[in-house]
């Protein structure tokens, strides 16, 4: 199976493009919108009927080094009485993001783009019921 | 920059931090090779805080196409299938990194960009403000 490639010879190259060695791409890791802040509603992870916890994964050879992952606290959902209702399901909501991986081969260093699946939070869903004949 | 461990046997010229500009292999490694079969794509309909998905396309971005969530209701769907306004549907937002062609239209020159996307919605108890 082919691994997707970023960039391509398919593109007409404008004159202003920087020269890039074959098989690689130039990546500026000075992030655009670096200081943008998430304006998510306050502590929704605790107020949700499908609450979740956060875990920070840290990897010094990854950029960004910190990636936050959510885990649903319950299998069921929290009802109006604050009790777990197992007739409903808490399920993870996921989103793909890109990271840069730094690889050491002997004394040389190379960089690789990676797609990483991040669990962002949880939502409460009605279960799919499979009827057995 | 990000400090990384240095192989003690290597020359000291190696920078401990990520440099500002790097040359990256064109092949993207996929950490999520086995898409979780339990990961359903119909949660947007089955959720008590259902959402619609909107297509956003930008050829100068990698990925070019991103599907964004918008909550269908202000309230949440109760057991009877009606909207309950005592609860709130709110978007779950995430900052993700994408690549932006820089300069524009260049095939193999990018800059990282942080964008905020709404991934889905969740049902929350509202914050009640009591007026004195």
């Amino acid at each position: 199976r082919k691994i997707p490639k970023v960039g391509h010879t398919f593109f007409q190259k404008p004159e202003s493009c920087p020269p890039v060695p074959g098989g690689s791409m130039k990546l500026d890791i000075g992030i655009i919108n670096e200081n943008q802040r998430v304006s998510m509603s306050r502590n929704i992870e605790s107020r949700s009927t499908s609450p979740w916890n956060y875990t920070v994964t840290w990897d010094p050879n990854r950029y960004p080094s910190e990636v936050v992952q959510a885990q649903c606290r319950n299998l069921g959902c929290i009802n109006a009485q604050g009790k777990e209702d197992i007739s409903m399901n808490s399920v993870p909501i996921q989103q793909e993001t890109l990271v840069v991986r730094r690889k050491h081969q002997g004394c040389s260093v190379s960089f690789q783009l990676e797609k990483v699946l991040v669990t962002v939070g949880c939502t409460c869903v009605t279960p799919v019921i499979h009827h057995v004949q | 920059g990000i400090t990384i461990p240095r192989n003690p046997g290597c020359p000291n010229s190696e920078d401990k931090n990520f440099p500002r500009t790097v040359m990256v292999n064109l092949n993207i490694h996929n950490r999520n090779t086995n898409t979780n079969p339990k990961r359903s794509s119909d949660y947007y309909n089955r959720s008590t805080s259902p959402w619609n998905l909107h297509r956003n396309e930008d050829p100068e971005r990698y990925p070019s196409v991103i599907w964004e969530a918008k909550c269908r209701h202000l309230g949440c769907i109760n057991a009877d299938g009606n909207v309950d306004y005592h609860m709130n549907s709110v978007p779950i937002q995430q900052e993700i990194l994408v690549l932006r062609r820089e300069p524009p239209h260049c095939p193999n020159s990018f800059r990282l960009e942080k964008i905020l996307v709404s991934v889905g919605c969740t049902c929350v108890t509202p914050i009640v403000h009591h007026v004195a």
Epitope: P4, V6 | T35, S41, E57, Y62, S64
Partner: antibody, heavy 121, light 106 residues
């Protein structure tokens, strides 16, 4: 190699519904959207809409709202299009085609072989 | 919706002859794709984002244009180029196709 295998020809009665399928192989199914195209007997091509197997998102040409429902099943790597309340106007060849979400300049790069739908009483 | 008008609707050319067909959009668009279709087969991606040839497309084909006016050119017509060529825009929903230009060999 990349393949989009579409279901066989359909001969259906007016007023009924039909579901066409498009089974994908040879690539990572969730990296691509599936678009559906109608080709009329006059050889006119019309874009029906798109489904994203990853998120479940769909977008329709307003002309086909209420006519076509697009879905995809990740586990079987199959996209479906249901056509409802069929009339003779719906007699056509229907194609599924893939569209790379990561770099859109590829366009619709692989097409299924097409499914012929004939609506006749 | 954006209407794409292709002209001519039908044309014929001798082998070796230069062939140009046009696609006019009712509103300005950023990119144009072209698809080739032969009788009894599915359309094939031919040129995308105005001028980028799909893999396997002979270099005698070229695409150009901007705004509302786009064209596809065959520098030196060959027998295998006889087909119908459709332009397609994806700058605005719904995506639309032109009515096609049928190219025949003399």
């Amino acid at each position: 190699q990349v393949q989009l295998q579409q279901s066989g020809a359909e001969l259906v009665r007016p007023g009924t519904s039909v579901t066409l399928s498009c089974k994908a192989s040879g690539y990572r199914f969730t990296d691509y959207e599936i678009h559906w195209i109608k080709q009329t007997p006059a050889q006119v091509l019309e874009w029906i809409g798109v489904t994203d197997p990853e998120s479940g998102g769909t977008l329709h040409n307003p002309k086909f709202d209420g006519k076509a429902t697009l879905t995809a099943d990740k586990s079987s790597r199959t996209a479906y299009m249901e056509l409802r309340s069929l009339t003779s106007e719906d007699s056509a060849v229907y194609y599924c085609t893939r569209y790379y979400k990561y770099e859109s300049f590829y366009g619709m790069d692989y097409w299924g072989q097409g499914t012929s739908v004939t609506v006749s009483s | 919706q954006i209407v794409l008008t292709q002209s001519p609707a039908i044309m014929s050319a001798f082998p070796g002859e230069k062939v140009t067909m046009t696609c006019s959009a009712s509103s300005s668009i950023s990119y144009m794709c072209w698809y080739q279709q032969k009788p009894g087969t599915s359309p094939k991606r031919w040129i995308c984002d105005t001028s980028k040839l799909a893999s396997g497309v002979p270099v005698r084909f070229s695409g150009s244009g901007s705004g509302t006016s786009y064209s596809l050119t065959i520098n030196s017509m060959e027998t295998e180029d006889a087909a119908t060529y459709y332009c397609q825009q994806r700058s605005s929903y719904p995506w639309t196709f032109g009515g096609g230009t049928k190219v025949e060999i003399k």
